[in-house]
């Protein structure tokens, strides 16, 4: 029961996390114009991994994609790569974990196989989460560096006559979405790894051994410690706890759909 709950919860948390990583990657507000000195601005700039946008006070918004690949900063390329790797690993992890779920039966898949798949997906979720957190953190560090550099050069002028205000950028909503999503994916991965330990058979298969006590004809057949089906025949050397009876928590549950704003 606890194992299934842990595995199911790990899956759902990871699913939410990966959806968040995808959302963060697609969002345009990775960096937003700093409004500290001017809270009411006529032109508001914000930038994402794929395009930069300008929202005018007239309500008009214009976005331009970064059509160059070689002209982009190496750090931005690195962040893109980390986020994409995170999404790919997370997506594969989700696919693997669906088949690993204890509440879903696929043919005669053994628990050892499900345990391995749960561990694999858990590791994938952990790496995916770390990639997202790393990507967002690298971008945040880049912003902090640029922020203080632009603060130092806030006003440049021709003999002090003409002022050119340099636009400063601060953390955008996507960074917070990315950090939270990465954290959720990481937590989900850890939960899957914990669930894997509970799924893994702790004892190898035992051959049925008959003990004949004098005067009695009772056969003791030690089975798996998780047996709940009683002393059934185990002639084919199957693990007893892999039997057909299913507990309440093993009823098939369908993951609910989540809306992301």
């Amino acid at each position: 029961m606890a194992v299934t709950a842990c595995q199911g919860l790990g899956f759902v948390v990871s699913l939410i996390g990966i959806a968040g990583i995808i959302a963060a990657t697609c969002m345009d507000q990775w960096s937003t114009q700093d409004l500290y000195n001017n809270p009411v601005t006529a032109v508001f700039n914000y930038q994402g991994l794929w395009r930069s946008c300008v929202r005018e006070s007239s309500g008009f918004t214009e976005c331009r994609g970064y059509f160059t690949l070689l002209g982009l900063p190496a750090m931005l390329q690195a962040v893109r790569a980390l986020m994409i790797v995170g999404i790919v690993l997370g997506a594969i992890g989700l696919l693997v974990s669906i088949f690993a779920l204890k509440c879903i039966r696929i043919g005669s898949m053994e628990d050892s196989a499900k345990a391995n798949m749960t561990l694999t997906s858990g590791i994938m979720f952990i790496v995916s989460g770390l990639c997202a957190i790393a990507g967002v953190s690298v971008f945040a560090n880049m912003l902090v560096t640029n922020f203080w550099m632009s603060t130092a050069n806030m006003y440049t002028g021709m003999g002090g006559m003409v002022q050119t205000v340099q636009t400063r950028y601060t953390f955008g909503a996507a960074l917070f979405v990315g950090w939270v999503a990465g954290g959720l994916t990481l937590i989900g991965g850890v939960m899957m790894c914990i669930a894997c330990r509970g799924l893994a058979p702790e004892e190898t298969n035992y051959k049925a051994v008959s003990y004949h006590a004098s005067g009695h004809s009772v056969a003791y057949k030690p089975g798996g410690f998780k047996a709940s089906t009683g002393f059934g025949s185990n002639t084919k050397n199957k693990k007893i706890y892999d039997g057909g009876a299913r507990t309440e928590d093993e009823v098939q549950s369908y993951p609910s759909k989540h809306d992301y704003v």
Epitope: T41, S52, V54, S58, F60, R64, T164, V165, Q166
Partner: antibody, heavy 118, light 113 residues
Framework: QIQLVQSGPELRKPGETVKISCKAS????????MGWVKQAPGKGLEWMAW????????TYAADFKGRFAFSLETSASTAYLLINNLKNEDTATYFC???????????WGQGTSVTVSS | DIVETQSPSSLTVTVGERVTLSCKSS????????????LTWSQQKPGQPPKLLIY???TRESGVPNRFTGGGSGTYFTLTISSVQVEDLAVYYC?????????FGTGTKLEIK
């Protein structure tokens, strides 16, 4: 076609109040901001305010804070300019204009002449 | 506030002549986010409301004759009328649309000989 029709000329005494209306037609009123511009007789244009017609939030020029109130009636696609405690220097033609890309103003009302005289 | 200084204050030209009006801003109107200059040119004929000619310093508004051309960047801008027509008799205003308040220039009055 797109039109901004303003209310007729007004004659007021100092200390009185005047309310100018600007009715928009031919477009979705809340999709564009509304600007107000003042032009004193024989003078240049003076930007007064910029109103977000969706939220109703105005952005004023410093000279037009206090006695000037900018409001909207979105159901009637109308913007209003209220001037309290009129002064002689408020004598001018007031224009409303639709804000578009580049924060520019493409369609203008015909203007409302306000004369403040004792 | 940003201050726009227009020159000359008035100009008398003959029909067909090429004329350039200038507008100098006290602060750069170039937005780094989209590399656009937030400056507008408007034309006001006597007894009429202003009419938008140019926005983003060089983008001509639809319906505006192509003899009107906007140029410049940063703090210095120009409006060029390649061949002045009688109907171009008006006052021309440049306006900052980059930062509140959206101040107008003092205007250049174009007169025909």
């Amino acid at each position: 076609q797109i039109q901004l029709v303003q209310s007729g000329p007004e004659l007021r005494k100092p200390g009185e109040t005047v309310k100018i209306s600007c009715k928009a037609s031919g477009y979705t009123f809340t999709a564009y901001t509304m600007g107000w511009v003042k032009q004193a007789p024989g003078k240049g244009l003076e930007w007064m305010a910029w109103i977000n017609t969706y939220s109703g939030v105005p952005t004023y020029a410093a000279d037009f804070k206090g006695r000037f109130a900018f409001s909207l009636e979105t159901s009637a696609s109308t913007a209003y300019l209220l001037i309290n405690n009129l002064k002689n220097e408020d004598t001018a033609t007031y224009f409303c204009a639709r804000g578009v890309r580049g924060n520019s103003m493409d369609y203008w009302g015909q203007g409302t002449s306000v004369t403040v005289s004792s | 506030d940003i201050v726009e200084t227009q020159s000359p204050s008035s100009l008398t030209v003959t029909v067909g002549e090429r004329v350039t009006l200038s507008c100098k801003s006290s602060q750069s109107l170039l937005n780094s986010g989209n590399q656009r200059n937030y400056l507008t040119w408007s034309q006001q004929k006597p007894g009429q409301p202003p009419k938008l000619l140019i926005y983003w310093a060089s983008t001509r508004e639809s319906g505006v004759p192509n003899r009107f051309t906007g140029g410049g960047s940063g703090t210095y801008f120009t409006l060029t009328i390649s061949s002045v027509q009688v109907e171009d008799l008006a006052v021309y205003y440049c306006q900052n649309t980059y930062s509140f308040p959206f101040t107008f220039g003092t205007g250049t009055k174009l007169e025909i000989k």
